[in-house]
């Protein structure tokens, strides 16, 4: 009877991108007092683990520890909660969480086409490239949960490249990119060197647009 209870949440600590041989803890938690949590992996090998839930402060949780990350442990994980000893009466599944092993292949290069400081409002494109024939590039921004991904373009000047259009700059951040091959989507390269993108300039909405009369001027808003 799947889905009797609402889905729990699944988190990875310290994060879902895990270096080879390093430790990651997958935490399944809910405000429903589940007695057990089941962790299911789709990947190179399907597998299900079961742990007794810990209860405190109105939350039930279980920590599944992967002590040494290897390629066969990478994949898509979901967790379920169970309120009885019967393994068949479980909650709806958590949202899927992709656990990726990183650091397997040579690092790509990441560059900003506009230089180290970007004007607020200007369109930013970050380029990830490598001499390795990666099929896919993944761009991560520090503090953001999800990466952007793009297929690598055809080989040009000895490199395979993907250009990530980020749109008009609003605030800066630190970016990294990774490469992967289509037959092993959970196995990524080493991280590129981090790229700090700084954004300068403040929107001034009180000023006229080029089509408006120019008498409508005022003091700028400072958004620092």
């Amino acid at each position: 009877h799947e889905g009797v209870h609402r889905k729990p949440s699944l988190l990875a600590h310290p994060g879902r991108l895990v270096k080879s041989e390093e430790t990651v803890i997958l935490q399944c938690w809910s405000d429903v007092m589940f007695e057990h949590f089941l962790l299911h992996r789709e990947g190179m090998f399907n597998d299900t683990l079961r742990l007794i839930g810990e209860h405190h402060d109105g939350v039930s949780k279980a920590n599944f520890s992967i002590s040494r990350m290897t390629q066969d442990l990478a994949g898509t994980y979901r967790c379920y909660g169970s309120v009885t000893h019967s393994p068949y009466q479980v909650s709806a599944p958590s949202d899927p969480l992709d656990i990726v092993i990183i650091g397997l292949y040579e690092k790509p290069s990441l560059s900003a086409q506009l230089g180290p400081t970007v004007l607020a409002g200007e369109n930013v494109t970050l380029s990830c490239s490598s001499r390795s024939s990666y099929d896919m590039y993944h761009l991560s921004r520090e503090g953001e949960a999800h990466e952007r991904r793009l297929p690598a373009g055809p080989k040009v000047n000895g490199t395979f490249q993907a250009d990530f259009p980020l749109g008009p700059a609003t605030h800066g951040g630190t970016y990294r990119c990774f490469g992967s091959f289509h037959d092993s989507p959970y196995e990524w390269s080493k991280s590129s060197d981090p790229l700090l993108v700084s954004v300068t300039g403040n929107p001034s909405n009180s000023w006229p647009s080029p089509t408006e009369p120019s008498s409508k001027t005022g003091n700028p808003r400072h958004l620092h």
């Epitope: 400081t117 909405n205 080029p210």
Partner: antibody, heavy 124, light 113 residues
């Protein structure tokens, strides 16, 4: 070719507001690639970038911290010009003030076109 | 802010001789991502605004005579005039455009010996 023509009073009393205008010909203040800057030059401080205005779907500004609390740079699209206002001036603000264009052909922050300069004296 | 320091403050060179002006930045202005140095050189004659000579540390602006050349990388840069002409008498400034606020050197006054 692109030219910048400056105008404005050359003598300002301390504590008053310095106001200068820079008229653009051969380019547009609403250009989606250029930025429009004010730079000043004095014997004590040398060349000092003060700030800029630019348009990228909407108007933006960017000011040097040293003058941020006192400065306003505004575009005037109908006259294709931009202005500098510097409030609460002191004799330290006495300088030659230049308007300048920055074009992305050179990398952002390179000033390829300059106004003729206006010597503004702040009297106490 | 990035501080730009030029040396010498003034320089007297004979006509036809080589003039060398140095510029040092307080932090690197080389952007490793594109391997470009965000440094420009300007020439200013009395009563005139500065005129752009060189950008990307070594690329001459169109119309600038080829006796002017720029070199250097990271934090140390040089402007060289290979054979000084009378019209080169001016004050020369370096400027970083790596990050705002854009900052200039204090200037080097070049005279004829």
């Amino acid at each position: 070719q692109v030219q910048l023509q400056q105008s404005g009073p050359e003598l300002v009393r301390a504590s008053q507001t310095l106001s200068l205008t820079c008229a653009i010909s051969g380019d547009s203040v609403s250009s989606n690639s250029a930025t429009w800057n004010w730079i000043r030059q004095s014997p004590s401080r040398g060349l000092e970038w003060l700030g800029r205005t630019y348009y990228r779907s909407k108007w933006y500004n960017d000011y040097a911290v040293s003058v941020k609390s006192r400065i306003t740079i505004n575009p005037d699209t109908s006259k294709n010009q931009f202005s500098l206002q510097l409030n609460s001036v002191t004799p330290e603000d006495t300088a030659v003030y230049y308007c300048a264009r920055d074009s992305p052909s050179y990398g952002r922050g390179v000033f390829d076109i300059w106004g003729q300069g206006t010597l503004v004296t702040v009297s106490s | 802010d990035i501080v730009m320091t030029q040396s010498p403050d003034s320089l007297a060179v004979s006509l036809g001789e080589r003039a060398t002006i140095n510029c040092k930045s307080s932090q690197s202005v080389l952007y490793s991502s594109n391997n470009k140095n965000y440094l420009a050189w300007y020439q200013q004659k009395p009563g005139q605004p500065p005129k752009l000579l060189i950008y990307w540390a070594s690329t001459r602006e169109s119309g600038v005579p080829d006796r002017f050349s720029g070199s250097g990388s990271g934090t140390d840069f040089t402007l060289t005039i290979s054979s000084l002409q009378a019209e080169d008498v001016a004050v020369y400034y370096c400027q970083q455009y790596y990050s705002p606020p854009y900052t200039f050197g204090q200037g080097t006054k070049l005279e004829i010996k």
